[in-house]
Interface confidence: low
Amino acid sequence: GWVWNQFFVPEEMNTTSHHIGQLRSDLDNGNNSFQYKLLGAGAGSTFIIDERTGDIYAIQKLDREERSLYILRAQVIDIATGRAVEPESEFVIKVSDINDNEPKFLDEPYEAIVPEMSPEGTLVIQVTASDADDPSSGNNARLLYSLLQGQPYFSVEPTTGVIRISSKMDRELQDEYWVIIQAKDMIGQPGALSGTTSVLIKLSDVNDNKPIFKESLYRLTVSESAPTGTSIGTIMAYDNDIGENAEMDYSIEEDDSQTFDIITNHETQEGIVILKKKVDFEHQNHYGIRAKVKNHHVPEQLMKYHTEASTTFIKIQVEDVDEP
């Protein structure tokens, strides 16, 4: 019968001919009366056999990631009679893995959006690298993830590639972050290969800023001839938030005379001071009112940022008009 051991050839071998093993018949007494033949895909081009001894060699560099096994057939013939000594037999040459592929992040570029002020531990995104090496061959394809850039705001779980928030972030200070993740094979041992990817993390706005008046005092004038409903000037607050979170409402906080009103222009986010009752220079030539401003939408959990509304003082001078 046929005698052989399991055949393995390491990939990427640079030797011009690499001895893999020997195929032989147990009837072969070593007097060169038998001839061995190799058949099948790769026979003669990738693999050769010593016709006398049955020794098999690889004559080409192999890449396991391209092809991991070869199925060949062997024959042994008695040279004197030309007859087969053994029935033709099929055998396998396995290409064994070396760590020649670095981990690759196939889904990049990665982007994620996370609300600002999210608590520690909030999941941002999961990055996944793949390694073309053999996962069953030692640690060649066993990966560990680490953070090269992004501390102290982010952390990565070493075995899963899950990125989490590790420190609260304020969009108003910085609205995007570059996080660089490294994946290393061989679970970080010597000879490890690595790959990196960038993750763009964009902070979405939450309503963590209240509107604040630009000025603590506004001076406006109104003619005593102005009819009720007249716009006598505008006041303005600023809000570091954006979009809906920066929409605001102005209102009167203090006006003993009940002469004025404030309406909000939701396009410009300005407060328009309106005359509610006619004024008379001879009766009162100046007024002092206090206005306040609040955000339009404030979720319950963000009320802590909006405890005390910003206020401003408005001095209104009445202009005299000659009366008949």
């Epitope: 570029p109 982007e111 609205d175 995007e176 763009l200 954006i242």
Partner: antibody, heavy 120, light 111 residues
């Protein structure tokens, strides 16, 4: 490698409409936005609008609102851009460009361009 | 009149470093990622830099992008004759709810 192949050059009279196609291949068509950008002779690039092929959601530049229609056919992985009421200043090369999975992500692949000439 | 402002032209000699600027506002560059496109004569634009400073595969590391506040810039070091092209910045504008391009910069490589 992603491929975007556009339909051939067109010559149109003022007042007519033109429909340009862009056939996508070698990627998941329904996952990415597709924009249309035009370039008049000797001029810069001008964004016209964007479509998400899976739901057909569109956003058009203010300038083209009411004149442009973008559609997608998922069965053939093709997007179309139709521009109506053509005038001579619409003479330009029209490009389709693949966007990202988000509206605000870059255009990474471009079609070869389709020259539309508007002349009486 | 483009929403993003670029110089109409720039030039340099081979080996030099050239920078092209792109100026915008809070609603575009200030809020989103800047991308740069290269358009060689008679060809479709090609993505050169994305998300402010990332290079697609195949783009030499001579090209780099940066962003600060409401401005961005493209730097080309070790200028080569094949870099002669039009360069455009582009960004999504939150106010306009659409994409905006710079007017383009024609780069000339002087021999």
């Amino acid at each position: 490698q992603v491929q975007l192949v556009q339909s051939g050059a067109e010559v149109k009279k003022p007042g007519a409409s033109v429909k340009v196609s862009c056939k996508a291949s070698r990627y998941t068509f329904t996952s990415y936005y597709m924009s249309w950008v035009r370039q008049a002779p000797g001029q810069g690039l001008e964004w016209m609008g964007i479509i998400h092929p899976s739901g057909g959601d569109t956003t058009y530049a203010q300038k083209f609102q009411g004149r442009v229609t973008m559609t997608g056919d998922t069965s053939t992985s093709t997007v179309y851009m139709e521009l109506s009421s053509l005038r001579s200043e619409d003479t330009a090369v029209y490009y389709c460009a693949r966007g990202g999975i988000k509206l605000w992500l870059h255009f990474d692949y471009w079609g070869q361009g389709t020259l539309v000439t508007v002349s009486s | 009149q483009s929403v993003l402002t670029q110089p109409p032209s720039a030039s340099g000699t081979p080996g030099q470093r050239v920078t092209i600027s792109c100026s915008g506002s809070r609603s575009n560059i200030g809020s989103n990622f800047v991308n740069w496109y290269q358009q060689l004569p008679g060809t479709a634009p090609k993505l050169l830099i994305y998300t402010n400073n990332q290079r697609p595969s195949g783009v030499p590391d001579r090209f780099s992008g940066s962003k600060s506040g409401t401005s961005a810039s493209l730097a080309i070091s070790g200028l080569q004759s094949e870099d002669e092209a039009d360069y455009y910045c582009a960004v999504y504008d939150e106010s306009l709810q659409g994409w905006v391009f710079g007017g383009g910069t024609k780069l000339t490589v002087l021999s």
